[in-house]
């Protein structure tokens, strides 16, 4: 898949035979299938589309600049976000724990996968391609790509469910700490994301290829079993269905249920009693919805280009070059937008949430201070897990914090 978070080829791409199992489309990464000399069944080479090289050359540098920017912004933003949630007891709660999980997934991708991708873009080859560390990176790279996207997707689903649960049980006002159910959710999300990424680690190998007599090696998805052949065939649809449609459908369902719940209880006396609290819950729900919308906008172009490639593009068509140029351009734009999603959440939270904005400002200037003006007095109850500092005395000082410390 491409070297960019959702794919190899890559990117990566010997002559014009690249990423998509013997087609010309250089989709990254180096490397759906990265750069390999994949040939038609008769073993002969065909002519290429001239625009491909021009687009690839132009985007090589554009992608590098964007990747470096995403690396810096993503590392600073996600690390700061994690620091804010970890250091501030008032910020340690269910939805924020899920946001921290989201940030950690993005941070892992940004720190490990992006540098590999930039190397691949600039050097035109897989790092350490002639030793065992290169083989390890070849398996790690797509594994972390898929894990990171999986973590994002499942956390967004969990946040949507969490918002519905928060509204459905008005009286359940949580104190400081992470609810046990949220902790279990997070652990499950990470385990499931890693499990779903295992086929990538199995399927991606360093494949040797020859070009003009010279021996090269590239990292690509190479099906060697019936299951991996099946996975390779359905991969684009699986990615589109599970890693794109599922979180949107999940959000749509639970936000519809949440809206119905709010409308049904609109005139309840409990609602009046907790009007301030509900207002804040609505704000958190808006923030979560904003994260889902950003996810959809970032990932839609890439998924669309992949699906169009799968359904519309015919490599044997003599007039394929115009469509190829469009798909290639769309794919590169999609790759950059999708990669951008791994650094955009902290930025989105900065603009959407007043509390996060203040914490970001103070944390980036010095260290995030706990300002009492940011807290709203709400009673606490419910079982919770403290990340840090279990001293009961501290609970009194932090009584003002509540489950939805996000607005």
């Amino acid at each position: 898949d491409n070297p960019e978070r959702y794919s190899t080829n890559l990117s990566n791409h010997v002559d014009d035979f690249t990423t998509f199992r013997g087609t010309e489309l250089s989709f990254l990464v180096t490397t759906h299938q990265p750069t390999n000399l994949v040939l038609p069944s008769n073993g002969s080479m065909h002519n290429y589309c001239p625009q491909q090289t021009k687009i690839t050359s132009a985007f090589k540098y554009i992608n590098t600049v964007i990747s470096c920017t995403i690396f810096i912004v993503g590392m600073v933003g996600n690390a700061t976000l994690l620091r804010i949630i970890y250091q501030n007891k008032c910020m340690r709660n269910g939805p924020n724990a899920l946001i921290a999980s989201l940030a950690l997934g993005d941070l892992i991708y940004v720190v490990i996968d992006l540098p590999i991708n930039v190397f691949k873009l600039l050097a035109g080859r897989w790092p350490f391609d002639h030793n065992d560390f290169g083989v390890f990176l070849c398996k790690l790279f797509p594994f972390l790509q898929k894990s990171s996207v999986g973590i994002t997707v499942l956390n967004l689903c969990a946040l949507s469910v969490d918002r519905y649960r928060a509204v459905a049980s008005w009286s359940r006002v949580q104190g400081i700490g992470i609810p046990l159910v949220t902790a279990i959710e997070i652990v499950s999300i990470w385990i499931l994301s890693f499990i779903l990424a295992i086929p990538e680690a199995i399927g991606f190998v360093m494949v040797p290829f020859e070009y003009r007599g010279e021996q090269h090696k590239t990292c690509m998805l190479n099906a060697t079993s019936k299951f991996m052949e099946f996975y390779q065939d359905v991969k684009d649809w699986w990615l589109f269905g599970f890693y794109f449609c599922m979180p949107l459908v999940c959000t749509a369902i639970f936000y519809t249920l949440m809206t119905c719940e709010m409308l049904n209880r609109r005139n309840g006396s409990l609602r009046i009693a907790l009007s301030e609290h509900l207002k804040q819950r609505r704000e958190v729900a808006k923030t979560v919805f904003c994260l889902v919308v950003i996810f959809a906008l970032c990932w839609f172009p890439l998924h669309l280009s992949r699906i169009l490639k799968k359904t519309v593009y015919n490599e044997m068509d003599k007039n394929r070059c115009e469509l190829l140029s469009f798909l290639l351009l769309m794919d590169y734009i999609g790759i950059n937008l999708a990669t951008m999603n791994s650094c955009i959440n902290p930025i989105a939270l900065y603009f959407v949430s007043k509390k996060f904005k203040n914490c970001f400002q103070s944390c980036l200037c010095c260290c995030c201070y706990q300002s009492k003006s940011l807290m709203t007095s709400v009673p606490m109850n419910g079982t919770s897990i403290q990340w840090k500092n279990h001293d009961q005395n501290n609970h009194n000082t932090d009584r003002s914090s509540h489950k939805d410390s996000m607005n």
């Epitope: 990566n12 791409h13 010997v14 002559d15 014009d16 690249t18 250089s26 180096t30 750069t35 000399l37 040939l39 073993g43 002969s44 080479m45 065909h46 002519n47 290429y48 001239p50 090289t53 021009k54 690839t56 050359s57 600039l122 050097a123 035109g124 080859r125 020859e210 070009y211 003009r212 007599g213 010279e214 090269h216």
Partner: antibody, heavy 116, light 112 residues
């Protein structure tokens, strides 16, 4: 020392066939790509066909596709070009060249004339 | 096809002079492995072509350091710092990055 020696050229009528050979010595033949390049009477160079180390991958220029076949025998250290349905446009000096990221060694060439 | 345009077609020089031959490709010739397979060949009168420069700027073994290759993307140049009698002949540029591989039309280096 690397040596490439072409043979099999000659005068042939349009529609006829010829098989060119290129005997290689002085290097490990099976580890190099090989190509046939021709030089037309107006001195232009054209890549005719190329083959990878094990013979599994071949390339032909459009004008010879379906008429020419490039092959190799690694046991005999020999490269071949089977030419059929020859046209007057195929008249040229045919060179075989070793390819390893560049065509670093060339043979002296064999002349092919297609004329009635 | 990638069209390789060489200029000039003929280059009259005096021995000891500097010479420069330009080659322009109609498209980018960077291969997907990151390598630009741009070569320069010299064909001396009555001989087969011989490799001078490969991958834009690398001199082939035995080629004097008078020969320098440079360029990127679509524009490439071969420079000969001090022309000697043995340098006379036809110079061809060649791209081996994209099928079909193509040669330039040639530049004849001759004595003024």
């Amino acid at each position: 020392e690397v040596h490439l020696v072409e043979s099999g050229g000659g005068l042939v009528q349009p529609g006829g066939s010829l098989k060119l050979s290129c005997a290689a010595s002085g290097f490990t033949f099976s580890t190099y790509g090989m190509s046939w390049v021709r030089q037309t009477p107006d001195k232009r160079l054209e890549l005719v066909a190329t083959i990878n180390t094990n013979g599994g991958t071949t390339y032909y220029r459009d004008s010879v596709k379906g008429r020419f076949t490039i092959s190799r025998d690694n046991a005999k250290n020999t490269l071949y070009l089977q030419m059929s349905s020859l046209k007057s446009d195929d008249t040229a000096m045919y060179y075989c060249a070793r390819d390893y990221g560049a065509m670093d060694y060339w043979g002296q060439g064999t002349s092919v004339t297609v004329s009635s | 096809d990638v069209l390789m345009t060489q200029t000039p077609l003929s280059l009259p020089v005096s021995l000891g002079d500097h010479a420069s031959i330009s080659c322009r490709s109609s498209q980018y010739i960077v291969h997907s492995t990151g390598t630009t397979y741009l070569e320069w060949y010299l064909q001396k009168p009555g001989q087969s072509p011989q490799l001078l420069i490969y991958k834009v700027s690398n001199r082939f073994s035995g080629v004097p350091d008078r020969f320098t290759g440079s360029g990127s993307g679509t524009d490439f140049t071969l420079r000969i710092s001090r022309v000697e009698a043995e340098d006379l002949g036809v110079y061809f540029c060649f791209q081996g990055s994209h099928f079909p591989f193509t040669f330039g039309s040639g530049t004849k280096l001759e004595i003024k």
